[in-house]
């Protein structure tokens, strides 16, 4: 019986450790600046790193610019988006800007896309300053189902700061769905 | 056998509860305004409270102005930094400000420092207003190894809001490394 | 003995799963725009959805405009607040605005209210622009006791963006108190 108990304890530690790790998908994706779309209207950002520098992914999938949920659960989602402009880049088309981020969820089963979180600011980036910068941070707790996709849209993508510490988004699973 | 099973259940509840608590380091550090460093360029903030008001720490260490990781894991890191100026403090030497925060990770083994997250904004704090305020929030999910250190750098530290609800940073462990 | 072990494993899986879910209260509350207070001074927002769209709650209670903690623990709290104005809404009373959010904790046992987190910005929303927008995000890790209440105060509530992706706050339990 003692041996049996030891076996129970041992297998349980393994099982608990294994199931804990399996139960916690996460992703932290950083902007891939080699492929940022242009324009000033709202566009979906599809190029993100998932395996270099701070970028990482586990038990989730990154495909076609979207973060795909592989496991039902409640997740904390976040995004940090930095915009910047230096006068050496030339004049802005307009000095009045709407710098925005939208974190959206797409359900494949019922083809539909919904914004989970948005943030940003209208800015007056006058040509009188040599440098302009602005960052947005959003975060929230959402129920996600396997197969659902998370994507990030921004306005004025040509103004994005391409550093990995500046423009990124991510998710981590906090708990199962009852 | 029944008694044995009860013993297994009992010890497991204890073990599970104990290991769960041990496995979850956290810290929430609030600015210590009696010792804010000086300078207008980027400076490291080294004075933080860890045990008064909202400030707290568990299974992490605060030393020499840095938050030291004691346990490998994936952590959610965050910072909230507020800047403010009132005309009673005198005119600003420049009305054009770059108000920034940088959350950095230093590895002692390989002496190097890297920025994990940055945020902020350029601001025009005109003398036409008696009061100015601006807050930055950043957050992200990062793999941290025991011995690594997290620190916070800001521009214009003399403009920091010294309230514990205004200027703080923190971390909590979400999961183990596989 | 084998049967006994299987029984231990089975009951443990149930127990682990059940206790894990019970141990993780959460809430994500979205603004109820049908009942936003007016004025430009700091007011408490009392109308929030808890069961429609992205809004949800579990093992916490929403009552009288406050999020009530039912279970001691360390929680990650967050808020995202969006302000906006379009010229079609008429002129602003003042172009100089202080757009702020305060996340507060009220203890019933010792009747007192304390601000846990604050954020925002002073803004100059000139009549030269037809549209203005600004978002604030705050987040932090706090020890909460059963019976304590979390509420959100903002300045200029009449400028709040009523979308569920824009103005929300929430909490999720990360760990027990030792």
């Amino acid at each position: 019986i003692r041996a049996e108990k030891a076996m129970v304890d041992g297998s349980w530690l393994d099982l608990a450790k294994r199931s804990k790790l399996e139960a916690q998908p996460f992703a932290h994706l950083t902007i891939n600046a080699t492929n940022i779309p242009t324009g000033s209207h709202k566009v979906s950002l599809s190029s993100w790193y998932h395996d270099r520098g701070w970028a990482k992914i586990s038990n989730m999938t990154f495909s076609n610019g979207k973060l795909i949920v592989n496991q039902d659960g409640f997740y904390y989602l976040y995004a940090n988006i930095c915009f910047r402009h230096h006068e050496t880049s030339g004049d802005l088309a307009t000095e009045y800007l709407q710098l925005m981020v939208y974190v959206t969820k797409t359900s494949i089963k019922i083809p539909s896309s919904h914004t989970l979180m948005k943030g940003g600011s209208t800015k007056y980036w006058s040509g009188n300053s040599e440098f302009h910068f602005y960052s947005i941070n959003v975060g929230g707790f959402f129920k996600l189902r396997s197969g659902e996709e998370i994507s990030v849209e921004v306005s004025n993508p040509s103004l994005l700061d391409p550093d990995q510490d500046a423009t990124y988004f991510g998710a981590f699973k906090v708990r199962d769905i009852d | 056998i029944r008694a044995e099973k009860a013993m297994v259940d009992g010890s497991w509840l204890d073990l599970a509860k104990r290991s769960k608590l041990e496995a979850q380091p956290f810290a929430h550090l609030t600015i210590n305004a009696t010792n804010i460093p000086t300078g207008s360029h980027k400076v490291s903030l080294s004075s933080w409270y860890h045990d008064r008001g909202w400030a707290k720490i568990s299974n992490m260490t605060f030393s020499n102005g840095k938050l030291i990781v004691n346990q490998d894991g994936f952590y959610y890191l965050y910072a909230n930094i507020c800047f403010r100026h009132h005309e009673t403090s005198g005119d600003l030497a420049t009305e054009y400000l770059q108000l920034m925060v940088y959350v950095t990770k230093t590895s002692i083994k390989i002496p190097s420092s890297h920025t994990l997250m940055k945020g902020g904004s350029t601001k025009y704090w005109s003398g036409n207003s008696e009061f100015h305020f601006y807050s930055i929030n950043v957050g992200g999910f990062f793999k941290l190894r025991s011995g690594e250190e997290i620190s916070v750098e800001v521009s214009n530290p003399s403009l920091l809001d010294p309230d514990q609800d205004a200027t703080y940073f923190g971390a909590f462990k979400v999961r183990d490394i596989d | 003995i084998r049967a006994e072990k299987a029984m231990v494993d089975g009951s443990w899986l149930d127990l682990a799963k059940r206790s894990k879910l019970e141990a993780q209260p959460f809430a994500h509350l979205t603004i109820n725009a049908t009942n936003i207070p007016t004025g430009s001074h700091k007011v408490s927002l009392s109308s929030w959805y808890h069961d429609r769209g992205w809004a949800k709650i579990s093992n916490m209670t929403f009552s009288n405009g406050k999020l009530i903690v039912n279970q001691d623990g360390f929680y990650y709290l967050y808020a995202n607040i969006c302000f906006r104005h379009h010229e079609t809404s008429g002129d602003l009373a003042t172009e100089y605005l202080q757009l702020m959010v305060y996340v507060t904790k009220t203890s019933i046992k010792i009747p007192s209210s304390h601000t846990l987190m604050k954020g925002g910005s002073t803004k100059y929303w000139s009549g030269n622009s037809e549209f203005h927008f600004y978002s604030i995000n705050v987040g932090g890790f706090f020890k909460l006791r059963s019976g304590e209440e979390i509420s959100v105060e903002v300045s200029n509530p009449s400028l709040l963006d009523p979308d569920q992706d824009a103005t929300y706050f929430g909490a999720f339990k990360v760990r027990d108190i030792d």
Epitope: E87, S126, G127, N128, S129, E130, F131 | T38, G39, S40, H41, S89, G90, D91, L92, A93, T94, E95, Y96, L97, Q98, T122, S126, G127, P157, S158 | -
Partner: antibody, heavy 119, light 107 residues
Amino acid sequence: EVQLQQSGAELVKPGASVKLSCTTSGFNIKATYIHWVQQRPEQGLEWIGRIDPANGNTKYDSKFQGKATITADTSSNTAYLQLSSLTSEDTAVYFCARSLHYYVFFDYWGQGTTLTVSS
Amino acid sequence: DIQMTQTTSSLSASLGDRVTISCSASQGISNYLNWYQQKPDGTVKLLIYSTSSLHSGVPSRFSGSGSGTDYSLTISSLEPEDIATYYCQQYSKLPLTFGAGTKLELK
């Protein structure tokens, strides 16, 4: 190349006014502050004030309020210092200098203009 | 207004000497301090900004330090072209104020 070129020496009578110029090149004047600094004979440097050419906003040391008026013409990239009701006390070298918006140091200076107030 | 005091109005040193020039403020200025060099011909140049940052093109023999109310400029090894007057300037608050200057001469 960044340059601040100041107008030539002036000899003026007490009670008169004078307008000194500082013509800039090699940078966008609207992205800077232009400052004026006085140096009396055998004395140190004294800040008079500054202008933000982008919007015309000015700040002065109270000692020079009413005495000095700083203006700028962005079309010609030129800043001006007008001094009124001159006395012998205003005899000095006047420097213009620039600082970038986000940094409060004078990284480039003009060569100085000598003003002599004498009857 | 914040008063800036350079107690030493003139200083004699030999080539190769290590020279330190001090400057004190009437109140704490949070490291908001710059150093300038004025040559005998009147030209003025920025040397050090924000207490210790070397301006581009300035030789590395120049360095700055200090905190609170007390600041200093150091020339590690005096060169002939360093003969000039040195001014500190605070930018903690308006009005911007300079020290009276320290004239560096050759022994």
